[in-house]
Interface confidence: medium
């Protein structure tokens, strides 16, 4: 069908609550484009009827609420005047009862659900709520170990929980809760956040933390487009360089002629005492020579790699 495939990162989500994903790919969606969502390679688009539990809302796919059976690969097709891109998003839904410690830990949570507070400082946690304009979010409530937070050191500011004079006891499991209203119906959103405490490093001595990748392999088909984010937390005043390298060479230099593999533009989200940086690597077309090579994300003295590997053969197809 002439659409270029782009594989985005997995999203791990909690069942029985609203979830939304926005189909944006800045190089493409900045112009005049149409966006259509599909599930599991279905030829039938996701409904645009707002009464449907799963429906498309402008460029978003919206689940009201998400259910355990909604796991799967969703595609959004972005069609421009002269282009077509199909973005694949793998959604994994899990049943998590935040206050039931017997169920065990969470699966590999994304960086939004792992946050850091700095010992002895005033700092903040952020409740990440990404929904289309049609969803109205009420005031956020915060919980620690399933008890609502009401202490004198805590103040709520929009989507943030401000924490005064952070202490070691502030580490642990937090949750932020909001009531979402859509078409007159109300839903509860509850995000769990695992909080660790770090001492602020001295002058120039900060060690960045690479949240993702985690020295692992990624299965990817030959010939596809692949984008991988490197997510790094670091102090606000850091001077560390963040980049992707292969064979100890900057990817932009290594692939200078073909430009087949490129490093993206770095972005960051500012928290009170630290920044979350993202710099991606884009494989315009995965080639055989890319498999087995460690592609390294560097952040100051910290490094982490990904290795591309061919997917195992699917014998069910024969």
């Amino acid at each position: 069908d002439g659409c270029k495939d782009i594989f985005m990162k997995n999203e791990i989500l909690s069942a029985s609550q609203p979830f939304a994903f926005n189909c944006t790919f800045p190089p493409i969606t900045s112009g005049e484009v149409s966006v259509t969502w599909y599930k599991n390679s279905s030829k039938i688009p996701v409904s645009k009827i707002i009464q449907s539990r799963i429906h498309q809302d402008e460029t978003w796919i919206l689940f009201l609420p998400m259910e355990w059976g909604d796991s799967g690969v969703y595609q959004c097709v972005i069609k421009g005047r002269d282009s077509c891109h199909r973005i694949h998003v793998n959604l994994t839904v899990f049943e998590k009862h935040w206050c039931d410690t017997s169920i065990g830990g969470l699966p590999n949570l994304s960086d939004e659900y792992k946050q850091i507070l700095h010992l002895g400082k005033d700092d903040s946690l952020t409740c990440h709520l990404h929904f289309p304009k049609s969803c109205v979010l009420g005031p956020i409530k915060w919980y620690k170990d399933c008890n609502e937070i009401k202490g004198e050191r805590f103040t709520v500011l929009e989507t943030r929980l401000l924490v005064s004079n952070v202490s070691a006891e502030d580490r642990g499991n937090y949750a932020c809760q909001a009531i979402l209203t859509h078409s007159g119906k109300q839903y509860e959103v509850l995000n769990g956040i695992t909080v660790s405490i770090t001492e602020r490093a001295g002058y120039g001595g900060s060690v960045p933390k690479i949240i993702y990748p985690k020295n692992h392999s990624i299965e990817v088909q030959l010939g596809t487009t692949l984008i991988v984010d490197c997510n790094v937390t670091d102090t606000k005043d850091n001077t560390n360089l963040r980049c992707w390298r292969v064979n100890n060479t900057l990817v932009d230099d290594y692939y200078d002629e073909s430009k087949r593999i490129r490093e993206g533009v770095e972005t960051h989200v500012s928290f009170r005492e630290h920044n979350l940086y993202t710099v991606n690597i884009t494989f315009l077309e995965v080639k055989m020579e890319d498999y087995g090579l460690p592609f390294m994300c560097h952040a100051g003295v910290s490094t982490a790699y990904i290795i591309l590997q061919l997917p195992a053969p699917d014998f069910r197809a024969y």
Partner: antibody, heavy 119, light 107 residues
Framework: QVQLQESGPGLVAPSETLSLTCTVS????????VHWIRQFPGKGLEWIGV???????DFNAPFKSRVTISKDTSKNQVSFKLSSVTTDDTAVYYC?????????????WGQGTLVTVSS | EIVMTQSPATLSVSPGVRATLSCKAS??????VLWYQQKPGQAPRPLIY???YRHSGIPARFSGSGSGTEFTLTISSLQSEDFAEYYC?????????FGQGTKLEIK
Amino acid sequence: QVQLQESGPGLVAPSETLSLTCTVSGFSLTDYAVHWIRQFPGKGLEWIGVIWSDGSTDFNAPFKSRVTISKDTSKNQVSFKLSSVTTDDTAVYYCARKGGYSGSWFAYWGQGTLVTVSS
Amino acid sequence: EIVMTQSPATLSVSPGVRATLSCKASQDVGTNVLWYQQKPGQAPRPLIYSASYRHSGIPARFSGSGSGTEFTLTISSLQSEDFAEYYCQQYSRYPLTFGQGTKLEIK
């Protein structure tokens, strides 16, 4: 000891920009946030916004489009600007800082500066 | 936003008598409440933080109580210097909000 002092013109014409400076001493702006609060002639107090120790800012919703807060750490000064003023912005403007321990919210205040909006 | 409502607007009391000022929050703010005293031409002066703790240098005749939505400032035996305007403020949730004030005047 900790001190804050507001300065700026006492009279501003309608539709103009109100500009105030808060000069601090006894502490560093890299360690503490500075808040701006105003008090109307009818005595009511209203929180306007804050500049945090890292230089980021937050504002009360009605002010988001009109207020700018910045700071010059080397000069120990915080700058406050309120654009498109009307007579409703006539008030005493304060800068304030939290105390050094939790819960001790505005433990330190400037003396306040009366700003009258009039043509 | 959280609305803080103070009562009464004016309280006329004789020196040496106990004065009780009330402050109600429109939603639960825990104990994240402050009380200030303000005299004409001066900035507010913090008296009580966390609903019941006195700031340093505040005389023991000032006490605060309450949690959730109802708070009280009590001055056990009024001195002449206590006649002033009193404000409560919540810091549970931004925007930070203040009560409209109670004027304590000499009867």
